[in-house]
């Protein structure tokens, strides 16, 4: 059925009208407007931008636009006491200091309030000691160091290259290894694409460029001082010692010019293999400490940042639904940036702005969506997804009863090669159908659909003729909606052809060089990729809000559940003897998946045949679809991660950016061979299989005929 049947609207107000109203030139103008000065969370500049967006969304025609403020823990460098790292000689004299700021890009030399590179939420401290190079500081890197190379990081300052995993996981791993400080740096192997010039002549990272970012391990908690509850006027705040997820050791980021000076002196053990070598002309020795001539020299960190409770502002816009105003489809993306935010987040915010404008235009012509659409400009995403999480905590009772879907809208581009989509399996068919109707912006695919270019450039590893759609992880504002509340979620952006570098981001990520010019000159001069992303995000919102029957296909969940069950079973089968010894069986899980598959199939048949003119039955069927994602939520949450409650998906415990399937079982099995009490460890595996099997079975039953 076409979307126009949703409400009594003239046929011209369909998806096509909405999509045709989206203009690349407007996105370009909005991006320029949003990127001329920094919009750091908690600053006056970002408050002013919130008010500007509120005003413009009202002008565009939304029914209401409100600011929602919270007082959350943020982190800033000390303006008079800058952070840096030095090499000190045996007398304690500083013989080398890292730079205090990034050289500003051309045209921005006189901009004030550019926050220098820092690791947000680092504690203060001035540790000094020998350096140990820990590669990417992943779990497996520390296993290699400690178990294979017998290198002890206790009492050492570790230096790790950015990339592969979320920086907070790196810091957590370093803490667990006993390090007393962490230096993060961008190696050209990960942030300098061969054959491309560095900014301002190209999109590569210059040697003085540095990636900012928070180093929290919040596990979905939101504001560290008010986990589970909104940071409102009457909030009870924890003491800083009880705050959630704060690092305990000083951390600081540097660029590769400074890293060269630290790494070139490294002595000790040689790198274990070539995967530990980057692209600098240094030996990549692991250490500990410097080589012969420099063995008396040490590294000293000088970190003086402060944590401060600061007010943040979300902008929440409402376009009331004509038929089901109590069903919410949410489009949200953040507004705060580290500096100019040329890509992150403003390439996304500009797209949201244009989507709001298009919806507003239709509304002014008398149209309304079937369901309510909420638009959000989140604050303090860069400080731990704080704005979105606090708002969801404040509105959790409404959201869990009324939330249909959440579409995320951070950076629209991280490259210009092909589409990248991460979403719940419920949205697979929606994404496939939508992209078949959209034109590809890619060179060589003129006149072809987006689906075709996407499938060709990023094929599914399992299903031929279909594009890759990835699992949702975290590191963005969908987290609370999907992982905590169980609201069907998705995200889409244009990406690079860089499969091996999946979680490293684009070279200028979170640096001062992420400017409007970066996008306009090098990534998307015609803004055609931005327009395509606007069409995908906006088109998904349109369909979710306007189709009579929700565009969710529960059969796709059945397919992936079988795939995930097979995967976790094969991981467990690496320990056949223990499985036998401790009577570990996956039968209950496979049985639950089989039941889910059968029930989902029958539900889909009923969905084709029921009387859509009966509003009660329609609402009942739609509610079963809406609440299916919710059914995968375990109110008790995952072990030690109470705000990650989705049993099928969670952010990986080793990389917040990546999604893990059946995370409870996966974590119970991880490194199980090293556990001191195998009986207890395998008992936990059995418990997690039980929880997963029960949850899948319970979810299946929500799709059964109601009586």
């Amino acid at each position: 059925k076409s979307s126009n049947e949703a409400t009594n609207i003239t046929p011209k107000h369909n998806m096509k009208a909405f999509l045709d109203e989206l203009k690349a030139e407007n996105i370009k103008k909005f991006l320029y407007n949003f990127t001329q000065i920094p919009h750091l969370a908690g600053t006056e500049q970002n408050f002013q931008l919130a008010k500007q967006i509120q005003s413009q969304w009202k002008e565009f025609g939304l029914d209401s636009v409100e600011l929602a403020h919270y007082d959350v823990l943020l982190s800033y460098p000390n303006k008079t006491h800058p952070n840096y790292i030095s090499i000190i000689n045996e007398d304690g004299n500083e013989i080398f200091n890292t730079s205090l700021f990034e050289p500003p890009p051309p045209g921005y030399e006189n901009v004030s309030d550019i926050v220098p590179p820092f690791s947000a939420f680092s504690p203060q401290g001035m540790p000094e000691g020998d350096l140990v190079y820990v590669n990417y500081a992943r779990t497996e890197d520390f296993f290699k160091l400690e178990r294979d190379m017998k290198i002890n990081c206790s009492g050492k300052i570790v230096i790790a290259r950015y990339g592969k995993v979320f920086r907070g996981n790196k810091v957590k791993n370093a803490q667990l290894a006993g390090a007393k400080g962490v230096i993060l740096y961008s190696d050209p192997a990960d942030y300098f694409a061969p054959g491309v010039k560095s900014y301002p002549d190209g999109w590569n990272l210059p040697g003085g460029g540095v990636q900012r970012g928070n180093i929290l391990n919040l596990n979905g908690a939101g504001d560290p001082l008010t986990p589970g509850y909104p940071a409102n006027e009457y909030a009870y705040r924890r003491g800083i010692a009880e705050a959630v997820g704060l690092p305990s050791i000083p951390v600081h980021p540097i660029g590769y010019y400074d890293a060269q000076k630290l790494l070139e002196k490294m002595g000790g053990s040689a790198p274990p293999d070539s995967s530990w070598r980057g692209s600098l002309k240094v030996p990549y020795n692991v250490g500990p400490g410097f080589t012969g001539n420099f063995s008396t020299q040490k590294v000293k960190m000088h970190i003086h940042s402060t944590n401060e409770v600061t007010r943040i502002y979300n902008v929440i816009g409402t376009l009331r639904g004509a038929v089901e105003p109590d069903r919410y489809v949410i489009l949200g993306g953040h507004r705060d940036s580290w500096v100019f935010g040329g890509i992150d987040p403003q390439s996304g915010a500009a797209v949201v702005h244009e989507i709001v404008r298009s919806f507003g235009t239709l509304k002014k012509e008398g149209w309304r969506p079937r369901r309510t659409i909420l638009f959000a400009s989140w604050d303090a995403e860069e400080f731990g997804l704080l704005g979105s999480t606090e708002w969801a905590e404040e509105n959790s009772r409404l959201l869990q009863e009324r939330g249909v879907a959440y579409i995320n809208a951070d950076s629209s581009i991280e490259g210009n090669y092909t589409l990248r989509v991460d979403c719940t399996p419920l949205m697979y068919s929606l994404v496939h159908n939508l992209t078949k109707e959209l034109k590809s912006p890619d060179e060589g695919f003129e006149g072809k659909s987006l689906y075709e270019s996407w499938t060709k450039k990023s094929p599914s590893p399992e299903f031929s003729g279909m594009p890759r759609i990835s699992k949702l992880g975290s590191g963005n504002d969908f987290e609370v909606f999907f992982q905590r509340l169980g609201i069907a979620s998705g995200r889409a952006r244009y990406t690079k052809n860089w499969e091996t570098n999946k979680f490293s981001g684009y070279p200028l990520y979170h640096s001062v060089y992420e400017t409007y010019e970066l996008v306009e000159k090098f990534y998307d001069p015609m803004f055609k990729y931005h327009l395509t992303v606007a069409q995908v995000r906006g088109g998904m919102v349109f369909e979710l809000a306007n189709s009579i029957v929700l565009p969710f296909d529960c059969r796709d969940y059945a397919v992936v559940l079988r795939k995930y069950a097979d995967k976790i079973y094969s991981i467990s089968m690496k320990h056949p003897q223990e499985m036998k010894t401790y009577s570990v069986s996956f039968d209950s899980l496979f049985s639950a998946v089989k039941n889910f598959t059968e029930i989902a199939s029958k539900f889909s048949e009923r969905l084709q045949d029921f009387d859509k003119s009966n509003p009660i039955v329609l609402r009942m069927m739609n509610d079963q679809l809406m609440f299916l994602e919710r059914a995968f939520i375990d109110p008790l949450g995952l072990p030690d991660r109470p705000f990650y409650r989705h049993v099928i998906y969670a952010p990986s415990s080793h990389n917040k950016y990546a999604g893990e399937s059946f995370p409870g079982i996966y974590d119970a099995l991880f490194d199980i061979e090293s556990k001191v009490d195998p009986s207890k460890a395998w008992g936990e595996v059995k418990r997690q299989i039980y929880v997963a099997a029960f949850t899948v079975q319970a979810a299946a039953e929500t799709l059964s005929e109601v009586a």
């Epitope: 730079s99 050209p188 040697g207 060269q260 070539s274 070598r277 600098l280 002309k281 030996p283």
Partner: antibody, heavy 120, light 112 residues
Framework: QVQLVQSGAEVKKPGASVKLSCKAS????????INWVRQTPEQGLEWMGG????????NYNENFKGRVTMTRDTSSSTAYMELSRLRSDDTAVYYC?????????????WGQGTTVTVSS | DVVMTQSPLSLPVTLGEPASISCRSS???????????LHWYQQKPGQSPRLLIY???NRFSGVPDRFSGSGSGTDFTLKISRVEAEDVGVYFC?????????FGQGTKLEIK
Amino acid sequence: QVQLVQSGAEVKKPGASVKLSCKASGYTFTYFDINWVRQTPEQGLEWMGGISPGDGNTNYNENFKGRVTMTRDTSSSTAYMELSRLRSDDTAVYYCARDGNFPYYAMVNWGQGTTVTVSS
Amino acid sequence: DVVMTQSPLSLPVTLGEPASISCRSSQSLVYSNGNTYLHWYQQKPGQSPRLLIYKVSNRFSGVPDRFSGSGSGTDFTLKISRVEAEDVGVYFCSQSTHVPYTFGQGTKLEIK
């Protein structure tokens, strides 16, 4: 733009010392090593060594060890090279050259050269 | 020290014709990170040397695309696809993989 401006020509007697300067501009001085290279018709181009302006660390060619000293003054973005116990075969054009760091690790900018004549 | 040997030492070329210079090192120039730090410099009469090609095959900014570099391990080549009058000068290969850095003797390119 990047410039390396070297001091003027020198005439020295055997056994004396000469100290040459190289003033850098147009880039962040402390980020990039300064190399010293000399050129003679007989030996061609010879790398004498380099200095890291950030920490003052030096790396000398063994052929010149004990005779060459490289220093820098970060406040004036100037590198210096002193060669002692001069001999007649030290007569050459002496160049300072900026190391390009990643991705080059090559001498990306050169000074105009200083002619040193050693003659009794 | 790594010895860099260039050939020929003198190269007379007709304008518009190609030219090729060979450079051989006494040991491999592959660094532990997998990169090869072999570079080519051009020195025009009365001028300082200037970087032409870095890391075997990468043209430095502003260098015309008629210049190209190739090779691996110990054998390297600089090619000029069509020689122009302004290309007259001496061409040096150089390595910065091993300390001390060393240069070839130079190849003098002249117009026939």
